[in-house]
């Protein structure tokens, strides 16, 4: 058993049929010695008396808010949560496996630039009685500071018969140099509590590996005289690291119709303009990627050919 | 400790081309190592990230773009003195700081070159003959060093009398290649910045 926060405790249980469970001793936070009784949750049934209560925690029915009283007055609470371990593996029931970029990916993180600011998000099908708390650091043995905000519900989607909820959090490394060469990864730890179930999820990464620039901005077309070609130009996104001559991007320019199956024109360039063939009912799209370290491409920025 | 804006004219910077070749060569070599050594811990997640130039050179700090010198997190107090002549400095306006930056890059290359050559000698003794360093990568390191053209004491190639542990050597190769790729990215960024200034 360990303390998650004040008056909240996590009991780690090997989860299998007829498991013996864990013996837990609760102590009432009071100077009083006599006349103390214990109850669980909203029940008025007295579970025991005395300053300590010993319980055998085997299942979720044994978890919950234990309260010690004296003469009708509440003295203190202890909330017990369960963390299940099945076949030596901690449960991952609360969050959905996003399977990208690999199986068992529960947390996904992205950074728009090298400033040390990043966003992580996760998915769940649970809508109520759910809380998250996020901590982060650079390295684990001698951790350096990363400050994370509160996790918030950022999107809701319908997937078949289920509703899916996306939560996200923004974090900022306390003293980040955009030009630094990372040797210690960022560690992100998410505590998830659903009703009386506790789970924790972690992710470890270098900022350079989670870079995904914003799409290029200000796309403009200029038709070329006596030709089917158009010159398309754009600018670096505002959120990208500066100076741009140091933090350079490379671009992919594509002309395609509404359907992915349609024919296309595609060209890669390090410049902020390119010449392509425009077709009726097609769109010109441009996306960006770090020129020197190939992490993710940005989303497409698009303009219609016409 | 930063790069001034007054630097060589665009197109007068022979190191840019060599640095692009360097990044390409080390990226290819790392990809080859990951594929060939698929049963060894050779991915970014599996290896320890070591920097053989730590406390010996200060490339990131010495080559910091002017715009980042306002960022206190970028200004470490490491100081290293270097020799200051070089053929990539194709302008009289070149400052002492730029010379310091380029000589720091030169020292990085020299250290990695020695490590890679020592390692290759060991890998050539491996009866499995599983992996060797790409001669193209070694040649590209050499070309960039020549373009930088700094006079520097030659570092003797390390020789080891004991029987090499090939498993450890291959893991060390992965560690070195990962670190060198990150440094090659920095070098490419620096050259691009200098070329544009």
């Amino acid at each position: 058993i360990w303390e998650l926060k004040k008056d909240v405790y996590v009991v780690e249980l090997d989860w299998y049929p007829d498991a013996p469970g864990e013996m837990v001793v609760l102590t009432c936070d009071t100077p009083e010695e006599d006349g103390i009784t214990w109850t669980l949750d909203q029940s008025s049934e007295v579970l025991g008396s005395g300053k300590t209560l010993t319980i055998q925690v085997k299942e979720f029915g044994d978890a919950g808010q234990y309260t010690c009283h004296k003469g009708g007055e509440v003295l203190s609470h202890s909330l017990l949560l369960l963390h299940k371990k099945e076949d030596g593996i901690w449960s991952t029931d609360i969050l959905k496996d996003q399977k990208e970029p690999k199986n068992k990916t529960f947390l996904r993180c992205e950074a728009k630039n090298y400033s040390g600011r990043f966003t992580c998000w996760w998915l769940t099908t649970i809508s109520t009685d759910l809380t998250f708390s996020v901590k982060s650091s650079r390295g684990s043995s001698d951790p350096q500071g990363v400050t994370c905000g509160a996790a918030t519900l950022s999107a809701e989607r319908v997937r078949g018969d289920n509703k899916e909820y996306e939560y996200s959090v923004e974090c900022q490394e306390d003293s980040a140099c955009p030009a630094a060469e990372e040797s210690l990864p960022i560690e992100v730890m998410v505590d998830a509590v659903h009703k009386l179930k506790y789970e924790n999820y972690t992710s470890s990464f270098f900022i350079r590996d989670i870079i995904k620039p914003d799409p290029p901005k200000n796309l403009q077309l200029k038709p070329l005289k006596n030709s089917r070609q158009v010159e398309v130009s754009w600018e670096y996104p505002d959120t990208w690291s500066t100076p741009h001559s140091y933090f350079s991007l490379t671009f992919c320019v594509q002309v395609q119709g509404k359907s992915k199956r349609e024919k296309k024109d595609r060209v890669f360039t390090d410049k902020t303009s390119a010449t392509v063939i425009c077709r009726k009912n097609a769109s010109i799209s441009v996306r960006a990627q770090d020129r020197y370290y190939s992490s993710s491409w940005s989303e497409w920025a698009s303009v219609p050919c016409s | 400790r930063n790069l001034p804006v007054a630097t060589p004219d665009p197109g007068m910077f022979p190191c840019l081309h060599h640095s692009q070749n360097l990044l390409r060569a080390v990226s290819n070599m790392l990809q080859k190592a990951r594929q060939t050594l698929e049963f060894y811990p050779c991915t970014s997640e599996e290896i320890d990230h070591e920097d053989i130039t730590k406390d010996k050179t200060s490339t990131v700090e010495a080559c910091l773009p002017l715009e980042l010198t306002k960022n206190e997190s970028c200004l470490n107090s490491r100081e290293t003195s270097f020799i200051t002549n070089g053929s990539c400095l194709a302008s009289r306006k070149t400052s002492f700081m730029m010379a310091l930056c380029l000589s720091s890059i030169y020292e990085d290359l020299k250290m990695y070159q020695v490590e890679f050559k020592t390692m290759n000698a060991k890998l050539l003794m491996d009866p499995k003959r599983q992996i060797f360093l790409d001669q193209n990568m070694l040649a590209v390191i050499d070309e960039l060093m020549q373009a930088l053209n700094f006079n520097s004491e030659t570092v003797p190639q390390k020789s080891s009398l004991e029987e090499p542990d090939f498993y450890k050597t291959k893991i060390k190769l992965c560690i070195l290649l990962h670190a060198f790729r990150i440094r090659a990215v920095t070098i490419d960024r620096v050259m691009s910045y200098l070329n544009a200034s």
């Epitope: 070609q229 199956r261 024919k263 296309k264 890669f268 390090d270 063939i277 | -």
Partner: antibody, heavy 118, light 107 residues
């Protein structure tokens, strides 16, 4: 299977015109760009131009502007290359090539040898 | 027009050898470079697109690299069926242009 089948070899006199064909099968003809590339005996490859069969748009290499005409007939899924004012230097194997992407060549015809000789 | 220069123009090699062919563009073409293989009397066949992207059905011993002006095609362990002429082609701008070709011959 995506396939391009070209018409047979041609022998022409200098100054004449030749029209060679390229029949597409295994895909929707208008879904791919169609290019023509030539190769003189013992020489390298030379791109001549492309057509978008969907709308008849064409683009030619400057060297072949006015010399060649590329057309397409969607009713028969066939592309054509017409070469006019033939000279001995036009002796070559002419290939049609197609792709959903405009700028490189995924599928090739078997080639048509055009010989210009007096 | 963008000129593409291939080197060497021919190379003699044995089965099992590693062969590298280079292609240089007269100006920067990013990764807009494709490689083809042509056997005598046959049409060319696409091997690599956009400098390093593999083509399904092409053996993994063929790999490409490069960007900007310098590119290379590597055949890792030469097989008897690989003796052919190889061409690079730029798609950065029209007109599309090819390199002069590199003939890989049996030593």
């Amino acid at each position: 299977e995506v396939q391009l089948v070209q018409s047979g070899a041609e022998v022409k006199k200098p100054g004449a015109t030749v029209k060679i064909s390229c029949k597409a099968s295994g895909y929707t003809f208008s879904d791919y760009y169609l290019h023509w590339v030539r190769q003189a005996p013992g020489k390298g490859l030379e791109w001549m131009g492309w057509i978008d069969p969907e709308n008849g748009d064409t683009e030619y290499a400057p060297k072949f502007q006015g010399k060649v005409t590329i057309t397409a007939d969607t009713s028969t899924d066939t592309g054509y290359l017409e070469l006019s004012s033939l000279r001995s230097e036009d002796t070559a194997v002419y290939y049609c090539a197609a792709n959903k992407e405009l700028r490189y060549f995924d599928v090739w015809g078997q080639g048509t040898l055009v010989t210009v000789s007096s | 027009d963008i000129q593409m220069t291939q080197s060497p123009s021919s190379v003699s090699a044995s089965v099992g050898d590693r062969v590298t062919i280079t292609c240089r563009a007269s100006q920067s073409i990013s990764i807009n470079l494709h490689w083809y293989q042509q056997k005598p009397g046959k049409a060319p066949k696409l091997l690599i697109k956009f400098a390093s992207q593999s083509i399904s059905g092409v053996p993994s011993r063929f790999s490409g690299s490069g960007s900007g002006t310098d590119f290379s095609l590597t055949i890792n362990s030469l097989q008897p069926e690989d003796f052919a002429t190889y061409y690079c082609q730029q798609s950065n701008s029209f007109p599309l242009t090819f390199g002069g070709g590199t003939k890989v011959e049996i030593k």
